[in-house]
């Protein structure tokens, strides 16, 4: 239903990485505009992205208020230049999004190896603790702050001179691994939330190798 010159939005899709969260939809508007509303299951609707011709809406500011809540959004379609117009049922045409729980569903962004330091036959590899847009007491929380021990990292490492790989896990942002003296190693890390059933793993970090800028060596 709805007015003859508006179509309902469709393919409503949440795109979320490290809690930066955007709702996308189709179609590209022709003689119509959109407004988005978001709410928690028990909360009131809040309007965002008023009368926009975009087909996306950044809802980060809303979902970071409580990342463990489940959110629902809806996209209203209005005729361009006549936003007061309503559908045949007396209200604007709209479409609901799938439910979205940020804590369980936001994608884990590609991690970055911050540094590695060799001391004898040990190497300490540190993963950058990425800042999110989740706030507490007016400060932005890191990924570790938000997920705590639910977040682990997997390290892959190998001698530059061979293809044989090893792996290690940590529930902090640091690895301490044994290496052969005099050998250069390469490293890549991956973020994992083992308790999840979807979006469990990030993509691998860029590979960092000893003998390059980020490292430090001490006898």
């Amino acid at each position: 239903s709805g007015t003859t010159n508006t179509v309902a939005a469709y393919n409503l899709t949440w795109k979320s990485t490290n809690f930066k969260t955007i709702l996308e939809w189709e179609p590209k508007p022709v003689n119509q505009v959109y407004t988005v509303q978001i709410s928690t299951k028990s909360g009131d609707w809040k309007s965002k992205c008023f009368y926009t011709t975009d087909t996306e809406c950044d809802l980060t500011d809303e979902i970071v208020k409580d990342v463990k809540q489940t959110y629902l959004a809806r996209v209203f379609s209005y005729p361009a230049g006549n936003v007061e117009s309503t559908g045949s049922a007396g209200e604007p045409l709209y479409e609901n999004s799938p439910e979205f729980t940020p804590y369980l569903e936001t994608n884990l962004g590609q991690p970055t190896i911050q540094s590695f330091e060799q001391v004898g036959t040990k190497v300490n590899v540190t993963v950058e603790d990425e800042r999110t847009l989740v706030r507490r007491n007016n400060t932005f929380l890191s990924l570790r702050d938000v997920f705590g021990k639910d977040l682990i990292y997997t390290l892959y490492y190998w001698k530059s001179s061979s293809s044989g790989k090893k792996t290690a896990k940590t529930n902090t942002n640091e690895f301490l691994i044994d290496v052969d003296k005099g050998e250069n190693y390469c490293f890549s890390v991956q973020a994992v939330i083992p308790s999840r059933t979807v979006n469990r793993k990030s993509t691998d970090s860029p590979v960092e190798c000893m003998g390059q800028e980020k490292g430090e060596f001490r006898e």
Epitope: A168, T197, R200
Partner: antibody, heavy 117, light 107 residues
Framework: QVQLLESGAVLARPGTSVKISCKAS????????MHWVKQRPGQGLEWIGG????????MYDPKFQGRVTITADTSTSTVFMELSSLRSEDTAVYYC??????????WGQGTLVTVSS | DIQMTQSPSSLSASVGDRVTITCKAS??????LSWYQQKPEKAPKSLIY???SLADGVPSRFSGSGSGTDYTLTISSLQPEDFATYYC?????????FGGGTKVEIK
Amino acid sequence: QVQLLESGAVLARPGTSVKISCKASGFNIKDYYMHWVKQRPGQGLEWIGGNDPANHHSMYDPKFQGRVTITADTSTSTVFMELSSLRSEDTAVYYCARDSGYAMDYWGQGTLVTVSS
Amino acid sequence: DIQMTQSPSSLSASVGDRVTITCKASQDIKSFLSWYQQKPEKAPKSLIYYATSLADGVPSRFSGSGSGTDYTLTISSLQPEDFATYYCLQHGESPYTFGGGTKVEIK
């Protein structure tokens, strides 16, 4: 529900190779790590190696390095283990297992490989 | 490589007994320790993950404790179906290593 279905028992000659498979259902293998574990008759469990199907990283126990290759075909949700230069002590049950990051939470039913001339 | 020392290698117990099995790692494994039950001719079954968390469908008489290098599996009140072999596994670092196993037999 989650299932790991392994290929059937194999009889192989010493010096040859064997390739066994593990077909996963009920989950996306790219979201997990997949491993192979060996158990000789009457003995304990021994980790052979593992694979991350999302990025094709494979890791092996040094005892098996050079003789074992673990691969994954994400299009068919199947993990493979190929073991070469077979000897009598490779006679064992081989299990595939899913690694959640916290544990090997699901296991296949096991594939018996018998190496005999 | 990390060595896992599991003890005892076998024990005899009666239904209703409290049973404790320990695993000691040769270095800190940061709680990447899991416990498995295996019955004859069957695949291992996950009991405890991340040192202390109970796997789905596992009775609450099973519990795990420990951190660092020392870990324990406890069966608070042994049931007839608990007679089996138990293994610990460290998966904090490759090569992953299992304990030698503990066979729990009927006294």
